[in-house]
């Protein structure tokens, strides 16, 4: 199957790349994290319609089986193919540690 | 946040790994597989509550910000989190050829 | 756009102090900390040390314990780094750097000259 | 503290050829690793971080590859504005390190 990069719902209605702007509060993290407080957080969003950026043959799979048993099988879902690092200065025991997460902002999308 | 297993909305609903019994033409495989006739398909399906079994802090995020943007951001999404191999045999131009699949069942299954 | 501005060049005598400024604009200051980072003339960059401009939290360099304060005024969105007991070879530009959320930092302030000479 | 260690010291190069500098870190860092452009007089400017990943604005003949312990910028064709010192730098852990530089002067 093609792994198709155009939207056949429109422009932007597809699985792609959102960026959220969200505070330490919003995440639940405002009483551990110094820095940054807060945070543009890149995930992803959107629909994934037939053959719209398939991330292996599981997720073409789902989608046969979802337009045939629509109530049983779900559409394949928007989620990260690859993450970005991401830098956080923290509270600790004894003061402050620099911390990198490897899985906490989305890169880009596919749908599985 | 704790990578929960019991289901808050009760047995069987959260995300977890099901098997759906699907025959070549469902898949849209009959032109090109000649074995298996049938398949049973193992994938993941049912919903992602709080804290369970989240992938990643990437979840976790996306969990905080659903519940405080629940239009704009998504509940995370129940996904394979590893594939069992299987083995197609095939046609090809010059007869019939056996091809192993790394992608195409889930073996177990997350919140993303 | 982001901007750190530092105050102007400095000429002190060895064992005096100084006490170096970065105004921030373009951003929520307490958002973000700042890094004090020197450059000796012709030499490598070296990190001395960085302040939560949130809540005042600070990470020195080993070898600048002792010597150095860094603070902030969220009321002027200012960051300062001061520096005791001078000697010839802390004579250097003296940058401010505010954090990024991917640890490398495209924001610098334009530096500082702090002279040490008897 | 990790110490990153730059090479060549210094680079001659014609424009238009390609230039690869390297930086090695003493112990690994992942891929917490940043790459600066510095001229004269001028503070550094971020090119690369995430040891791959080209910071706004920087053209995409600069590149970053490696993790861990050993690290690559190359400038694919280099430009006369691109003759300058490059630095990297590890953020994995507290104190930030700086490799010595590599100056990259016109042949």
């Known amino acids: 199957a093609r792994n198709g990069d155009r939207c056949p719902l429109g422009p932007g209605r597809c699985c792609r790349l959102h960026t959220v702007h969200a505070s330490l509060e919003d995440l639940g993290w405002a009483d551990w994290v110094l820095s940054p407080r807060e945070v543009q957080v890149t995930m992803c969003i959107g629909a994934c319609p037939s053959q719209f950026r398939e991330a292996n043959m599981h997720a073409q799979i789902k989608m046969n089986l979802h337009r045939l048993k629509p109530d049983t099988v779900p559409a394949p879902c928007c989620v990260p193919a690859s993450y970005n690092p991401m830098v956080l200065i923290q509270k600790t025991d004894t003061g402050v540690s620099l911390q990198t997460y490897d899985d906490l902002l989305a890169k880009d999308c596919h749908c599985v | 946040a704790r990578n929960g297993d019991r289901c808050p909305l009760g047995p069987g609903r959260c995300c977890r790994l099901h098997t759906v019994h699907a025959s070549l033409e469902d898949l849209g495989w009959a032109d090109w597989v000649l074995s298996p006739r049938e398949v049973q398909v193992t994938m993941c399906i049912g919903a992602c509550p709080s804290q369970f079994r989240e992938a990643n802090m990437h979840a976790q995020i996306k969990m905080n910000l659903h519940r405080l943007k629940p239009d704009t951001v998504p509940a995370p999404c129940c996904v394979p989190a590893s594939y069992n191999p299987m083995v197609l045999i095939q046609k090809t131009d010059t007869g019939v050829s056996l091809q192993t699949y790394d992608d195409l069942l889930a073996k177990d299954c997350h919140c993303v | 756009q982001v901007q750190l501005v530092q105050s102007g060049a400095e000429v002190k005598k060895p064992g005096a102090s100084v006490k170096v400024s970065c105004k921030a604009s373009?951003?929520?200051?307490?958002?973000?900390?700042i890094n004090w980072v020197r450059q000796a003339p012709g030499q490598g960059l070296e990190w001395m040390g960085w302040?939560?401009?949130?809540?005042?939290?600070?990470a020195y360099a080993q070898e600048l314990q002792g010597r150095v304060t860094m603070t902030t005024d969220t009321s002027t969105s200012t960051a300062y780094m001061e520096l005791r007991s001078l000697r010839s070879d802390d004579t250097a530009v003296y940058y401010c750097?505010?954090?990024?959320?991917?640890?490398?930092?495209?924001?610098w302030g334009q530096g500082t000259l702090v002279t040490v000479s008897s | 503290e990790i110490v990153m260690t730059q090479s060549p010291a210094t680079l001659s190069v014609s424009p238009g050829e390609r230039a690869t500098l390297s930086c090695r870190a003493s112990?690994?860092?992942?891929?917490?690793l940043a790459w600066y452009q510095q001229k004269p007089g001028q503070a550094p400017r971020l090119l690369i971080y995430?040891?791959?990943t080209r910071a706004t604005g920087i053209p995409a003949r600069f590149s970053g590859s490696g993790s861990g312990t050993e690290f690559t910028l190359t400038i694919s064709s280099l430009q006369s504005e691109d003759f300058a010192v490059y630095y990297c730098?590890?953020?994995?852990?507290?104190?930030?390190?700086f490799g010595g530089g590599t100056k990259v002067e016109i042949k």
């Open positions: 750097v505010r954090d990024t959320q991917y640890g490398g930092s495209p924001y």
């Open positions: 373009g951003y929520t200051f307490d958002s973000y900390g």
């Open positions: 302040i939560s401009a949130y809540s005042g939290d600070t």
């Open positions: 112990q690994s860092v992942s891929s917490n």
């Open positions: 995430g040891a791959s």
């Open positions: 730098q590890q953020y994995n852990n507290w104190p930030i390190t």
